[in-house]
Amino acid sequence: MRTEAQVPALQPPEPGLEGAMGHRTLVLPWVLLTLCVTAGTPEVWVQVRMEATELSSFTIRCGFLGSGSISLVTVSWGGPNGAGGTTLAVLHPERGIRQWAPARQARWETQSSISLILEGSGASSPCANTTFCCKFASFPEGSWEACGSLPPSSDPGLSAPPTPAPILRADLAGILGVSGVLLFGCVYLLHLLRRHKHRPAPRLQPSRTSPQAPRARAWAPSQASQAALHVPYATINTSCRPATLDTAHPHGGPSWWASLPTHAAHRPQGPAAWASTPIPARGSFVSVENGLYAQAGERPPHTGPGLTLFPDPRGPRAMEGPLGVR
């Protein structure tokens, strides 16, 4: 199942000469340290299941493990939303659900997870090696996206385990929001540590209840940005791309498709690594999002007729407020 980084249990120092006040002031820095390690690190999981009853039927489940409020969920296939993927559904917590064929039923399972049933035949039918991606826009974390696909050998009726394999990117608002809180907390932590540098520091010990729990890792921005360059996207089987790309505009389709720049970082680089290689979701630098393309007067790469052009498909006005009201 999911592998989660767990924060080691905090072992307070033995009570001694410092007394109750000293005890509390020593625990506080370690609580803050824990927050610095774990805060601002939401995770997205994706689970893909092929139904045993119907080989062309898939169920995709996605969830967001973060404390922020979700403002939009976008489900796509064939790759991430801004990198050649085609939108299957957009779920808005206030305005409802918009879905594109072959999506049959998108719905909220909880306030932080969604499910989507895909059915198709012929050109619009999904294939076993199709990659499905879920992008959660939330405040204050920003945008987080993860992709998953069925393992090549999976039998119908079986599902790939949830894959916490996010694309390491966040929107500017998320970075500023979380980073601001973290920066303040960590500066305060350093301040407290300096005050207590003459005292022996408490020891971090693994939790007694889970002695083999992996220690949490805090990724430095440089690590995150490097990792973002090396995360492989799953290979796209072009025969499984949705029919909407070809048939939505038979008369005078968009001429800008062929002339659009493609970003090397968004090209498929190898076989599907999502399901087998969980990558911790840690903050990273901003990559160019659909909304930024739109503001610059460009289209996102490979955007087809079935793809929304903004984080909210209602357009840039939707970002003015929670409901996009004028």
């Epitope: 006005r317 409901l323 009201v325």
Partner: antibody, heavy 120, light 113 residues
Framework: QVQLQQSGAELMKPGSSVNLSCKAT????????INWVKQRPGHGLEWIGE????????NYNEKFRGKATFTADTSSNTAYMQLSSLTSEDSAVYFC?????????????WGQGTSVTVSS | DIVMTQSPSSLAMSVGQKVTMSCKSS????????????LAWYQQKPGQSPKLLVY???TRESGVPDRFIGSGSGTDFTLTISNVQAEDLADYFC?????????FGGGTKLEIK
Amino acid sequence: QVQLQQSGAELMKPGSSVNLSCKATDYTFTDYWINWVKQRPGHGLEWIGEILPGSVTTNYNEKFRGKATFTADTSSNTAYMQLSSLTSEDSAVYFCARGSDYSYYAMDYWGQGTSVTVSS
Amino acid sequence: DIVMTQSPSSLAMSVGQKVTMSCKSSQSLLNIFNQKNFLAWYQQKPGQSPKLLVYFASTRESGVPDRFIGSGSGTDFTLTISNVQAEDLADYFCQQHYSTPPTFGGGTKLEIK
């Protein structure tokens, strides 16, 4: 006052195509989805699909995929629906309607409708 | 697709009476985030286009008289017209506006005796 003005009635031959128009006034055309709805006596209202003008983003009811094609001209604030390979089943009144601010599919303003009759 | 079923298909009332019509959906229209039900009611007078009366099951569109009252939750909804007027003669449609494709009920025809 928001208005959607639709083109006039059409009498068409089977097998032909027709292009219906819907001109929007008094709101920002590119900010709202335009929905197309079919009404036949005894069949109620059926959603054909939607287009977000200026974005090439469309969404079709599977039942009407291949039958209807949506386009929009942002310079004239006009949405279009082309119906192809017409049969008697396509005889109906067709409405355009604007998607609202508060929900994707609550339609707050409607055109007056265009009657299409398919007859040989 | 979500199936919408309206009843009765028609009813005849006298001016001043209270009218209730029902709409049922094949699945819940309740949004877990804002606890709103994504159901709309439209009025279509003869020879005219539909007009939005109520959305989110009970929120009246601006300009709609307060004698039109929407209620219900989940899968069962009601439109009540208190003190029916002659100008209320029309077809009334319910519609789920929760997910694609939006679907309509078959309609209730209100006739005035």
